[in-house]
């Protein structure tokens, strides 16, 4: 047998060389590049396992969009045809709660999650006999990377074996720890930086295949929470990084989400974007915002992919994406996941399992409506998936997809066998579809969420609500005491009330200056390298939030450390959520908060509000009867007509959909 090269096994403390063999069926499918379903026998630690695989049809596109750049920096859009891809999911016969994510492109490569162990498998280099290396994931050497606080072992959860009929593939993959009965879909966008691209020999195909493999691994981990990962886009910075990656992880994350909001969202709709970087941050494996998955401005994370395998890297991305999905670290909480450490443990442990705490955290996010964007099944032109009727994703050529025949029995609008609408139906799903009919134009489908938001309405000819817009950043709110920023009026009192209850309010400026000049975890202007930054007096209002009149102590599923600082006759209250260095601190003053006359907070600095680029003269542009929205169009108040609120009408904008319909009696009394 060929011996593995040093490079291939230098990261393993133990491994076996095996030769998997493929089980063939008597009824063979028509020849195709890769089978829809396939089974193999593999050996691990003296035992033979039969593994059953089916192509992960929900994962990748028919119109796979890959963005790259040419030497002049021009954006290039490519649609490589990879419908019959080689990425599979599956289970191990006879092993309860097992799951597999494998690619069968050039030999078998991927992850096998058994009851109490996870294995990696990959082709043996230079072998001509289909030999593979198999190893326990626990035997992979890893740098001691972290997201924050130190690692704590989690007690093992004992799994019960139950006698039952062998379930179908779909049942097996759905019945894992389904946190909520309704499947959620994360539309994921991955961005690969220039250094990682260079490290892959500047081979775009190799980068693409590796990221598809990564997405398949993520899907196999998230399916236990009834969450599906749908890869909707990939961008490779082939010509140079489009953000500054100098500085700490927090700086890079901030730069990345700003770039995402400005350039990426407009190009491809998605729920979360993850940046893949080669550069490390002194032991920090990644960083992401908590609970921001549906946010226009903060739904992102950064992930360090240096000298580690894609299998190990998958648990880093799962962790950072978990933060976006509302999951806090497991450390110091009573969590279990059936393994010695779980995905949301703060040390990047290479775990494959989400803990009970992660499930609860995600459930909280959905109950608080923080996960509304995860309910939509990706549109046909947005999902990188080979079309398949019955996968509950509306693929190209389909009008609807109600799932399995049993599920379709309950769907009044969709013909399950053809994935076409029933003859009488106009639609089968969407915010503007009711009883298989389009809701009338003028039906409210997305109400205002704050004084900096505007409503959207059905247009009467589509099942979808108009795209979400809000009042342009920089518009005054709270009686000129604050500015609108990403659809919210950002002011200190409101932030204090979110953390400390409805009676709380901002502490005096002296509190901010005194506490934030210290440069410790309770008072700082961010993190640089391995230490907290002291706030200059002029930036103190943009550091750690200081509140007074506190009557409630916050409960967010994670108990924060609370500090009380006496200052000139009042008590200043601040919090440190101790979420770890990979999570931006929700106890800091929010970006966009007004920190002085004509100034706002950005990156913990009090800067001129002109950075918001507010350029709307509502008197001239909207004739004093409206505001400018985030598309720089007038949203007219009731009684005035778009586009310029100059003539009498029914309000709204060119973006909002029609606000009125004489025939509309949707809920009228």
């Amino acid at each position: 047998a060929a011996r593995p090269g040093f490079q291939q096994t230098s990261h393993l403390s133990s491994y076996e060389i095996i030769t998997p063999w493929r089980l063939t069926r008597e009824r063979r499918e028509a020849p195709r590049p890769y089978s829809k379903q396939v089974s193999y026998v593999i050996q691990a630690e003296g035992k033979e396992h039969i593994i059953h695989l089916e192509r992960n049809k929900d994962l990748l596109p028919e119109d796979f969009v890959v963005y790259t750049y040419n030497k002049e920096g021009t954006l290039i859009t490519d649609h490589p045809n990879i419908q019959n891809h080689c990425h599979y999911r599956g289970y191990v016969e006879g092993v309860h709660n097992s799951s597999i994510a494998l690619s069968d492109c050039f030999g078998l490569r991927g992850l096998l999650h058994l009851e109490n162990a996870s294995y990696g498998i990959e082709p043996l280099q230079n072998s001509s006999h289909f030999e593979h290396i198999i190893y326990r994931m626990d035997d992979v050497y890893k740098e001691p990377l972290k997201c924050g606080v130190s690692n704590k072992d989690i007690e093992k959860e004992t799994a019960k074996d139950e006698e039952e009929e062998p379930p179908s593939m779909t049942q097996l993959l759905r019945r894992r720890r389904a946190v909520l009965p309704q499947t959620r879909y994360v539309e994921l966008f991955i961005v690969v930086d220039k250094e990682r691209y260079d490290m892959m020999g500047r081979n775009q195909t190799a980068v693409r295949e590796e990221m598809i493999l990564l997405a398949n691994y993520l899907d196999s981990m998230y399916i236990m929470l009834n969450i599906r990962i749908v890869l909707v886009g990939l961008e490779i910075w082939t010509n140079g990084n489009l953000i500054n990656i100098v500085g700490g992880a927090g700086d890079v994350l901030g730069n990345f989400v700003q770039w995402r909001e400005k350039f990426l969202i407009t190009r491809r709709r998605h729920d979360s974007a993850q940046l893949v970087l080669k550069k490390g941050f002194g032991g920090t494996a990644g960083m992401a915002f908590v609970g921001t998955v549906c946010s226009r401005s903060h739904a992102g994370g950064i992930n360090v992919f240096g000298q580690i395998t894609v299998e190990t890297f998958a648990s880093i991305v799962a962790h950072e994406l978990g933060h976006n999905l509302g999951m806090n670290h497991d450390d110091g909480r009573d969590c279990s996941c059936g393994a010695k450490s779980c995905i949301m443990n703060s040390g990047a442990s290479g775990s494959r399992n989400f803990s009970s705490c992660s499930a609860e955290d995600f459930e909280k996010l959905t109950l608080n409506k923080g996960g509304n964007c995860l309910l939509n099944i990706p549109k046909p032109d947005e999902a990188y998936s080979a079309p398949s009727c019955g996968n509950k994703l509306v693929d190209a050529g389909e009008e609807c997809d109600c799932g399995t025949p049993k599920e379709c029995e309950l769907d009044p609008c969709c013909e399950g066998s053809t994935c076409k609408l029933k003859s009488f139906a106009e639609c089968a799903y969407g915010d503007c579809c009711k009883d298989c009919r389009f809701l009338p134009g003028g039906t409210l489908c997305r109400g205002k969420t704050s004084e900096c938001d505007v409503p959207e309405y059905c247009n009467g000819s589509s099942q979808f609500c108009q795209p979400d817009v809000f009042i342009q950043n920089g518009y005054p709110c709270q009686n000129n005491k604050a500015y609108c920023y990403n659809g919210m009026c950002q002011y200190y009192d409101a932030q204090c009330q979110v953390i400390f209850g409805s009676k709380a309010k901002a502490a005096p400026k002296d509190c901010f200056i005194e506490v934030n000049s210290k440069g410790d975890r309770f008072g700082n202007c961010g993190f640089s390298g391995n230490e907290y930054k002291k706030c200059a007096t002029g930036n103190a209002l943009c550091g750690k939030l200081q509140c007074e009149n506190v009557q409630e102590i916050p409960v967010f599923g994670i108990v924060p450390a609370i500090i009380q600082t006496p200052s000139r006759g009042t008590k200043c209250w601040g919090v440190d959520f101790q979420l770890g260095s990979d999570v931006p601190d929700p106890g800091m003053v929010n970006e966009g908060t007004k920190c002085g006359a004509g100034k706002i907070c950005r990156n913990f600095q009090c800067v001129d509000a002109s950075v918001l680029n507010y350029d709307c003269d509502v008197q001239k542009k909207c004739h004093g009867h409206g505001v400018c929205n985030s598309n720089k169009n007038c949203h007219c108040e009731n009684g005035w007509a778009p586009p310029n609120c100059e003539t009498k009408g029914y309000g709204g904008s060119v973006d909002s959909g029609p606000t009125y319909n004489e025939m509309n009696t949707a809920l009228r009394d």
Epitope: L439, T443, K448, N638, W640, Y650, T659, N664
Partner: nanobody
Framework: EVQLVESGGGLVQAGDSLRLSCAVS????????VGWFRQAPGKEREFVAV????????YFADSVKGRFTISRDNAKNTVYLQMNNLKSEDTAVYYC??????????????????????WGQGIQVTVSS
């Protein structure tokens, strides 16, 4: 600046009626949808009723349907909530709300507090049984 002032609250017996008024100053209310919310001690603020800016649509919470009516008098810049056959569970602080972008029509679900920018101070209604 738009200001809302509620009046007409008080203590009544179960089965009695009350009419709440909401007087708006600072701007003409002709382009505002106006609603009423209420909050009982230890409970979340809940929707009661809304009238669209045109006056052509009204919506009521299921718990008050058939007992409460809402009307507007744009000439007086005032909105009224007529409450009949009051029950002890109607006891709460009642808030008048207004918004110039929320239309108050074409709804498939009840309004949320976040849809209204302007709020009154609230007025107490107590129904004794």
């Amino acid at each position: 600046e738009v200001q809302l002032v509620e009046s007409g609250g008080g203590l009544v017996q179960a089965g009695d009626s009350l009419r709440l008024s909401c007087a708006v100053s600072g701007r003409t209310i002709s382009s505002y949808a106006v609603g009423w919310f209420r909050q009982a001690p230890g409970k979340e603020r809940e929707f009661v009723a809304v009238i669209s800016w045109t006056g052509g649509s009204t919506y009521f919470a299921d718990s008050v349907k058939g007992r409460f009516t809402i009307s507007r008098d744009n000439a007086k810049n005032t909105v009224y909530l007529q409450m009949n056959n009051l029950k002890s569970e109607d006891t709460a602080v009642y808030y008048c709300t207004a918004d110039r972008f929320t239309t108050g029509s074409g709804r498939t679900s009840y309004p949320r507090p976040s849809e209204f920018d302007h709020w009154g101070q609230g007025i107490q209604v107590t129904v004794s049984s």
